[in-house]
Amino acid sequence: KNLKSPQKVEVDIIDDNFILRWNRSDESVGNVTFSFDYQKTGMDNWIKLSGCQNITSTKCNFSSLKLNVYEEIKLRIRAEKENTSSWYEVDSFTPFRKAQIGPPEVHLEAEDKAIVIHISPGTKDSVMWALDGLSFTYSLVIWKNSSGVEERIENIYSRHKIYKLSPETTYCLKVKAALLTSWKIGVYSPVHCIKTTVENELPPPENIEVSVQNQNYVLKWDYTYANMTFQVQWLHAFLKRNPGNHLYKWKQIPDCENVKTTQCVFPQNVFQKGIYLLRVQASDGNNTSFWSEEIKFDTEIQAFLLPPVFNIRSLSDSFHIYIGAPKQSGNTPVIQDYPLIYEIIFWENTSNAERKIIEKKTDVTVPNLKPLTVYCVKARAHTMDEKLNKSSVFSDAVCEKTKPGNTSK
């Protein structure tokens, strides 16, 4: 009896694992084996595919074959018993195009209100992704074990920290990788769960902001308690992307080591041009807080995108706000020759409920205010250029009282 060729051959490539699966064409014939050949582009001869010769099952692994993953290859399969079937040719394919990204490795560390996530590619030193190692981004799904309500976080790098969690609570998450340059989305890792620790005695510093004064950066933060010392560390933001980088190390800013105030000042010139992360930690001598949320700061933008200055004209039911150019040292206005958009936040002095206005104009009306009431206003500038998607810090808050009724003219 003539053997029939196997059918429906599927090539599955995950990272550097090359798996072939196929269907037997004739289930009634026993003791059949299967063999594959392959052919590279531009070659006439077929070569035996090592790892896929005389296979008794309907699956084989040819990961040991050292292929150029960007080069098209063709496969063919036949069945063998006493005689052989005709060859069945599989559509040619390029391994890199066909490859899927495997599940990443995930390692978790718990804090009281945060989880630190270390992500690395599932296949170390992968041949498939050798040229794309630094281009991986990740996304994750996280949920409280008790509730199951999922939150998705997109476009993160190999080291990520999730904040604003609850102490002593179990959180579960899964992570997948993506190579956006090649339109590839990977498969999820197994689910990892971790319990956050008991609440720390000292909270981390909050509301960290960087501004520029004279030739210095001024770093400010808020803290709950008095009589504390603080330290500030920096990291080049690029290092967040690279999991294997042995140079990944947070370092101290000398001017901001063991400072006793909730701000520190350091010269603009100590940093080479680039984007950095900063974090602050508090200590009372015996206990130390966890690190604050990390803030990103760009030396090139920070150096010239200053908070706006503004004047307020108060009426009974509104404020007219006139935004001017920010002032440099010596009280000279800074010319910022790129389009800006202004974010104005205002609130009643006795309340925490903030309202926001976004405006391109430099004269803005804040409507619907109550007469004889103190309102506070702060503003910041954003660049409108998509490539320069940057923001200044907020200006200091200015508080004014509205006029008595019927002075809206």
Epitope: L247, E257, F266, V270, Q272
Partner: antibody, heavy 117, light 107 residues
């Protein structure tokens, strides 16, 4: 392991242009900062400038009119060009890496340049 | 530019001794100071940054201290491999500048 290796002509005549190459292995120059520093015969060290991961540059103002630092990311190399050299430019030239502040944790072995007519 | 004055220019010491090299800046450099060791025919090696932080892999017999304009590098219990030249360098403003070096020789 990060390794840097300088290469260059060794000898130049006054008024010529000096071109040096720093080849980096074990690390991509699309991360961090890549500097040039030179050491004169009397052991004085002088900082010359850098090119960053993004291609931005800084030159020591004392050299600004004569210096150019460029890179080729496909070769993982960066370059120093110094125009109109004089005897005063006789020195050992080092390439070095920094991580964001101006101190240098990896250095090349250095290449010696002698300027002489 | 900030000038860095290093002293002594040279010193002789024996294995097991403790030595101190000092560096004075022409202005306050706020601990933005690094120390390097350079052996004959080799490239400089970073020992200390931020005036007192030891670079990874540097033996603990090296220590940096100081503040304002005055800084020092101390080497406890000198080892044969410690002989060579030492340089300080500030990075508080640009351009960064180096000290003129201290040559440490075996007595």
């Amino acid at each position: 392991e990060v390794q840097l290796q300088e290469s260059g002509p060794g000898l130049a005549k006054p008024s010529q242009t000096l071109s040096l190459t720093c080849s980096v292995t074990g690390y991509s120059i699309t991360s961090d900062y890549w500097n040039w520093i030179r050491k004169f015969p009397g052991n004085k060290l002088e900082y010359m400038g850098y090119i960053s991961y993004s291609g931005s540059i800084y030159y020591n103002p004392s050299l600004k009119s004569r210096i150019s630092i460029t890179r080729d990311t496909s070769k993982n190399q960066y370059y120093l060009q110094l125009n109109s050299v004089t005897n005063e430019d006789t020195a050992t030239y080092y390439c070095a890496r920094s991580g964001g502040m101006y101190y240098f944790d990896y250095w090349g072995q250095g290449t010696t340049l002698t300027v002489s007519s | 530019d900030i000038q860095m004055t290093q002293s002594p220019a040279s010193l002789s010491a024996s294995v097991g001794e403790t030595v101190t090299i000092t560096c004075r800046a022409s202005g306050n450099i706020h601990n933005y100071l690094a120390w390097y060791q350079q052996k004959q025919g080799k490239s400089p090696q970073l020992l200390v940054y931020n005036a007192k932080t030891l670079e990874d892999g540097v033996p603990s017999r090296f220590s940096g201290s100081g503040s304002g304009t005055q800084y020092s590098l101390k080497i406890n219990s000198l080892q044969p491999e410690d002989f060579g030249s030492y340089y300080c360098q500030h990075f508080w403003s640009i351009p960064p500048t180096f000290g003129s070096g201290t040559k440490l020789e075996i007595k």
